[in-house]
C-alpha cells in the first residue's frame, strides 16, 4: 500500500521532521504550511486549521518561504548618490548601489547603506590603488622622475618626458619642459588613466545614509511559533 500523505496541519511522529515548506508550530505542536515568497502568515495554524497566508502590501516583501506575521518593509528610496539596481517587489527588497565616482563606505546585506565619493589625488600624487565598489582610492606621492598635474581619482603618476635639452626640470606635479627640439617620451608601462571601478558615481553631492534598512527574510525570524528552518524536527 502507498504511504498515507499527511495534510497540514498534522502531528509529526517521534524523531521525524516537518516536510519541505512546512514548519513546526510550538503553540499548536503541529507541522503547518509555510507561506510562499510575497506572502506572510495572516493567521497561525492551530490543531485543526492550517496557516492562513495573505499577500504582502505595497512596499513590503518576503523573499523566502516563511511564517512571519508581517511582511518586511522595503528600504527607503535610493539617495542621490545611489542608483536603484533592484526594484522593491512583493518578493524582493529594493537594492541601491553607488553611482560612478562613489564607493560603498558602509554595506548592508544587499546593496549599500552609505556611499562616499572616491578620493581624488591632488597634483604631485597619483593613484596607487584604484577605487572599487567597496574601497576608496589610495594615493601615493609621485616618485622622482614621475609626476601628476591633475586632481583625479583615476590618474597615476606618469614619467617625465625626456628632453634632449631641458628647459625646466620636472617635479612631482609638473612634467619636464624641453627646449624646442622634439622630446623623447620615456616608455611608460600601461595607460595614463586607470579604468573606473565598476560601480562609481558623480562627485558632487555628499553621501547620505539610507534611513530604512529592513533586513532580508533570510535572517528575519518570526517571534511566533518556531524558527524558519526548511525542515524542522517535530514530534
Amino acid at each position: 500500500l502507498p504511504a498515507q500523505v499527511a495534510f497540514t496541519p498534522y502531528a509529526p511522529e517521534p524523531g521525524s521532521t516537518c516536510r519541505l515548506r512546512e514548519y513546526y508550530d510550538q503553540t499548536a505542536q503541529m507541522c503547518c504550511s509555510k507561506c510562499s515568497p510575497g506572502q506572510h502568515a495572516k493567521v497561525f495554524c492551530t490543531k485543526t486549521s492550517d496557516t492562513v497566508c495573505d499577500s504582502c502590501e505595497d512596499s513590503t516583501y518576503t523573499q523566502l518561504w516563511n511564517w512571519v506575521p508581517e511582511c518586511l518593509s522595503c528600504g527607503s528610496r535610493c539617495s542621490s548618490d545611489q542608483v536603484e539596481t533592484q526594484a522593491c517587489t512583493r518578493e524582493q527588497n529594493r537594492i541601491c548601489t553607488c553611482r560612478p565616482g562613489w564607493y560603498c563606505a558602509l554595506s548592508k546585506q544587499e546593496g549599500c547603506r552609505l556611499c562616499a565619493p572616491l578620493r581624488k589625488c591632488r597634483p604631485g600624487f597619483g593613484v596607487a590603488r584604484p577605487g572599487t565598489e567597496t574601497s576608496d582610492v589610495v594615493c601615493k606621492p609621485c616618485a622622482p622622475g614621475t609626476f601628476s598635474n591633475t586632481t583625479s581619482s583615476t590618474d597615476i603618476c606618469r614619467p617625465h618626458q625626456i628632453c634632449n635639452v631641458v628647459a625646466i626640470p620636472g617635479n612631482a606635479s609638473m612634467d619636464a619642459v624641453c627646449t624646442s627640439t622634439s622630446p623623447t617620451r620615456s616608455m611608460a608601462p600601461g595607460a595614463v588613466h586607470l579604468p573606473q571601478p565598476v560601480s562609481t558615481r558623480s562627485q558632487h553631492t555628499q553621501p547620505t545614509p539610507e534611513p530604512s534598512t529592513a533586513p532580508s527574510t533570510s535572517f528575519l525570524l518570526p517571534m511566533g511559533p518556531s524558527p524558519p528552518a526548511e525542515g524542522s524536527t517535530g514530534d
Epitope: 510550538q26 503541529m30 518570526p222 517571534m223 511566533g224 528552518a229 524542522s232
Partner: antibody
Amino acid sequence: QVQLVQSGSELKKPGASVKVSCKASGYTFTTFGMSWVRQAPGQGLEWMGWINTYSGVPTYAQGFTGRFVFSLDTSVSTAYLQISSLKAEDTAVYFCARRSNFAYWGQGTLVTVSS
Amino acid sequence: DIVLTQSPDSLAVSLGERATINCRASESLTASGNSFMHWYQQKPGQPPKLLIYRASNLESGVPDRFSGSGSRTDFTLTISSLQAEDVAVYYCQQSRHVNWTFGGGTKVEIK
C-alpha cells in the same frame, strides 16, 4: 538522542530565590517549546506553563504567575525556571519537559524550602 | 483548561492479570485525525516515562503489553499481563489545548 539535563538539588530558606536550569541536547533547541512541571512530595504532576524557545515568550498556568519566571539562553540550549520569595509550599521536584505533542523529561530538580 | 479525571485512584492486580486505567476529559481531545492524549509511567525518584502517545501509539522501546485506546473524551490504558516491574503511578496528559493538563494519577500495585 534527546536529553534534558537539569541542575542539582537546592536547599533554600523561605524568602530566598532559586534558579533551576535545564540543558537540552540531541535536537535543535529552538524548534520545540519547553514546559515546566511541578510535583510536590507524594502528589501528582502539575503543569506550570511553557516558554516558546524561539521567541522567548513565556505562558504561565494559573497559580504560577508573579513569583515564577521562565527564561532561556539559546546559545547554550538551556531553559531556566526562577522562583522568588520562596515558601515552604514550593518544596517540590521541578521537571522540564520538551513541549511536543507529548513530553521528553528532564530528571527533575528537588527544591526544598525550609527554615 | 481541560480537566482530566483519572480512575481508579489505585489498582491492585495479580501478576499476569490485566490492568485497566481510564481517563475522561472535560472536552474532546480529538482534532485533525488525532487524539491528543498521552500516557506516562512514573516510578519513585524518576521522571515520568512516555508509554503511549496520541491515544494509541506505542512509544519505541515500550513493551507491547501496554496499549492505549479511545477518542474524543474517553481514553483507556491497558496492561495486558501485569509484570512486577509495572508497579508505578500512571498519568494521562492532554496536549489538545495550548495549556497542558495531567490526570491525578493511578497507583498500580500487585495483589
